[in-house]
């Protein structure tokens, strides 16, 4: 969480951002809130990016003002216009690119004052893993697949029964470049698994951590997976 304060002749207002991550090819949110003002026509929101000459986005007098927008963001940005009056200056970024990573500034002017806060935005790819029993294999084998990751993640297997065990000797992980030549498909195979046990396939890079669990018994198979973004710090 980053909290910034204005330092002008006017009063300062508090602006708060949250560091976040964008998934390449999908839409992302750059989060920013400020002390609300009841005078909508007086509110100005400016999003700037370090190293970029033009503006990322500008909202003023109740609508987008994009004449100064940098080419790299053309047609890809929007604020939640209906939420500005209650202090939400968050920016929706369409079709996130690897090059969108960097330091952004959310700069706010209201009738009460000015304020700004910076935001670190990371970009990469992350996806939910799915763990299945590989019936084609000669021995009891589990296959963990996740379609899109970048940068290249680490993959670690764990087991409920053999807690703390190192499965690196009985697993094999491969990374296959996807067609857009940036993200990769992750495939990890775990051999010699035993029934009546829960196995976890954990995939992690500096942006996200995802886990796929599978419980194999004689009568059924139960699966569960979840994904968590790392380093969501407010500012």
């Amino acid at each position: 969480l980053i909290i910034g304060f204005g330092i002008s002749g006017r009063h300062s207002i508090t602006v708060t951002t949250v560091a976040s991550a964008g998934n390449i090819g999908e839409d992302g949110i750059l989060s920013c809130t400020f002390e609300p003002d009841i005078k909508l026509s007086d509110i100005v929101i400016q999003w700037l990016k370090e190293g970029v000459l033009g503006l990322v986005h500008e909202f003023k007098e109740g609508k987008d003002e994009l004449s100064e927008q940098d080419e790299m963001f053309r047609g890809r940005t929007a604020v939640f216009a209906d939420q500005v009056i209650v202090g939400n200056a968050s920016l929706r970024l369409k079709n996130v690119q690897l090059t969108d990573a960097g330091t952004y500034k959310c700069y706010i002017i209201t009738s009460k004052g000015k304020g700004n806060a910076n935001l670190e935005y990371k970009t990469g790819a992350f996806s939910m893993p799915e763990v299945n029993v590989d019936y084609n294999a000669s021995s009891e084998t589990l296959r963990c697949e996740a379609p899109r990751w970048f940068p290249q993640p680490t993959v670690v297997w764990a087991s409920q029964v053999d807690q703390g065990a190192n499965f690196s000797e009985v697993s094999n992980t491969s990374f296959e470049l996807n067609s857009e030549n940036v993200t990769m498909k992750v495939v990890s195979v775990l051999y010699n698994v035993t029934i009546n046990n829960t196995y976890s396939c954990m995939i992690e890079n500096d942006i996200a951590k995802a886990t796929g669990d599978i419980k194999v018994t004689e009568s059924e198979i139960k699966r569960r997976s979840h994904l968590q973004l790392l380093n969501s710090k407010a500012s």
Partner: antibody
Framework: EVQLVQSGAEVKKPGASVKVSCKVS????????MHWVRQAPGQGLEWIGA????????EYAPKFQGRVTLTADTSTSTAYMELSSLRSEDTAVYYC??????????WGQGTTVTVSS | DIQMTQSPSSLSASVGDRVTITCQAT??????LNWYQQKPGKAPKFLIY???QLAEGVPSRFSGSGSGTDYTLTISSLQPEDFATYYC?????????FGGGTKVEIK
């Protein structure tokens, strides 16, 4: 659940003052503007003013400037509207209304103020 | 101040009718307009925000549209519980101002 609960009806004489309260629950009271709106019998809605409890910033409609005072007690999440120098045309239902998710999204039940000699 | 002219001031309609209420601002309010429903002896109820977005729990027979200075509230098929007074509110420019109201009565 968001709730705005107002104080009871008041009967006042011309020239007197009235203070209406509005107790808030269900959202962060200090971080959002609280407005006051009134409605005279058989008439439309009229904005009086607003307060930002976190900083005690206030804004008033020019018509009420100098005669209305908005305050807030952040310890009890209660907003107050005091109207002085009452006259018969101030007879109305007074509402508090929040701007939490949107402008005037939640309303108090209203407080009837009757000014009569 | 921005003036909001609401029309008609009252209308009579039957259950199942399509009803349209309009609000005209004295200047562009950039879609910064909400609609409220009020029944006798009750506080106004939040209906539509930012011209066209339905508030939580509001039936889909209600819809809003408009831009610039002209805005419309439409009830596609009037139900018995819809007989009430409707108000528009502009919050683009200070101070916020309401329309005069439209009373929807049973024919």
């Amino acid at each position: 659940e968001v709730q705005l609960v107002q104080s009871g009806a008041e009967v006042k004489k011309p020239g007197a003052s009235v203070k209406v309260s509005c107790k808030v629950s269900g959202y962060p009271f200090t971080s959002y503007w609280m407005h006051w709106v009134r409605q005279a019998p058989g008439q439309g809605l009229e904005w009086i003013g607003a307060i930002y409890p976190g900083k005690s910033d206030t804004e008033y409609a020019p018509k009420f400037q100098g005669r209305v005072t908005l305050t807030a007690d952040t310890s009890t999440s209660t907003a107050y509207m005091e109207l002085s120098s009452l006259r018969s045309e101030d007879t109305a239902v007074y509402y508090c209304t929040s701007t939490w998710t949107h402008y005037f999204d939640y309303w108090g039940q209203g407080t009837t103020v009757t000014v009569s000699s | 101040d921005i003036q909001m002219t609401q029309s008609p001031s009252s209308l009579s309609a039957s259950v199942g009718d399509r009803v349209t209420i309009t609000c005209q601002a004295t200047q562009d309010i950039v879609k910064s307009l909400n609609w409220y429903q009020q029944k006798p002896g009750k506080a106004p109820k939040f209906l539509i925000y930012y011209t066209a977005q339905l508030a939580e729990g509001v039936p889909s027979r209600f819809s809003g549209s408009g831009s610039g200075t002209d805005y419309t509230l439409t009830i596609s098929s009037l139900q018995p519980e819809d007989f009430a007074t409707y108000y528009c509110l502009q919050f683009y420019e200070f101070p916020p101002t309401f329309g005069g109201g439209t009373k929807v009565e049973i024919k």
